[in-house]
Interface confidence: low
Amino acid sequence: ESALITQQDLAPQQRAAPQQKRSSPSEGLCPPGHHISEDGRDCISCKYGQDYSTHWNDLLFCLRCTRCDSGEVELSPCTTTRNTVCQCEEGTFREEDSPEMCRKCRTGCPRGMVKVGDCTPWSDIECVHKESGTKHSGEVPAVEETVTSSPGTPASPCSLSG
C-alpha cells in the first residue's frame, strides 16, 4: 500500500504554517535537521550554517558545524542535515593517526627509491625501493638526497565530523 504520513499529532496552527520550524516528535524522535526540546514535546530546527543533525534523533542540541582550519579548504558548507566537508590544501595531507592537522607532503623520495603514489589530501607520496619494491616510511630525507616531484591533485573529498 502506498501512503505518506497521516500523523495528526500536531496542533492545528502548526499544521497550517508553511514555514513552521517546530512540530511534535514521532515516537520520541525528531527528523534530520532538527533536535528535540527539553520537555520532549517539540522538534526544533537546527540553524543553517551553525549546527546540524544527520539522523532521526532525540538530541537536546544539534551538533555544531565543523569550521575548516587554516590549511584546509571547504569542499561543501554545513547544512542543517550535513556537516561541513573540509579537505587539506594541495601539497598537504591528513593521516588517520593524526587527524587534527594537515601535514606537508614530502617533495620527493630518498635516493634508491622511486615514487609510486602522489601526494593526496589523505596520504603522503608513496616511495618504494627500486629493487625490492618495499615501501618506505622513514623521515623526510635531506634535500640533496631527494628526487623531486610536484604535489598530486586532490582526487576525492575527505569528510571530517566536528
Partner: nanobody, 122 residues
Framework: QVQLQESGGGLVQAGGSLRLSCVAS????????MGWYRQAPGKQRDLVAQ????????NYAPSMEGRFAISRDNAKSTVYLQMNNLKPEDTAVYYC???????????????WGQGTQVTVSS
C-alpha cells in the same frame, strides 16, 4: 521498498515559475521526511527543501526560502515543490528524496527518484 517518480521539470524563462511533483509508491512509514535536492553540472547534490511529519515542519536552504515552497498531499502520496521567481542559477536536475526511519535510533533508509531537469534561461 519505495519508488519515487518526479515530474514537472522543463525549460522556463528567468522570473518564471514551475511546480515539481513527486509521487511515492510502496510503503512510506509514519516517521519520514520527504524533500527535494538539486544537482547542477559539476556540483554536488544539495538540499532545496524538506517537509516532515505530516507537513508540520519544513526546512529550506536559505537561498530558496521565500521563492520555493514545499508541500505534500497525503491522499495522493505526492510531494510538491513550487518554484517562483526562477533564476538561471536554479538550473539543475531536481531529485525527490525520502528518508524513512527504521525501528532503530538513527537508522534510516534513503530513497531517491531519477530526477527531473529544470533549465532557466536568461
Amino acid at each position: 521498498q519505495v519508488q519515487l517518480q518526479e515530474s514537472g521539470g522543463g525549460l522556463v524563462q528567468a522570473g518564471g515559475s514551475l511546480r515539481l511533483s513527486c509521487v511515492a509508491s510502496g510503503s512510506i512509514f509514519t516517521n519520514n521526511a520527504m524533500g527535494w535536492y538539486r544537482q547542477a553540472p559539476g556540483k554536488q547534490r544539495d538540499l532545496v527543501a524538506q517537509i516532515t511529519m505530516g507537513g508540520g515542519i519544513t526546512n529550506y536552504a536559505p537561498s530558496m526560502e521565500g521563492r520555493f515552497a514545499i508541500s505534500r498531499d497525503n491522499a495522493k502520496s505526492t510531494v510538491y515543490l513550487q518554484m517562483n521567481n526562477l533564476k538561471p542559477e536554479d538550473t539543475a536536475v531536481y531529485y525527490c528524496n525520502a528518508e524513512v526511519k527504521s525501528a532503530d535510533w538513527g537508522a534510516y533508509a534513503n530513497y531517491w527518484g531519477q530526477g527531473t531537469q529544470v533549465t532557466v534561461s536568461s
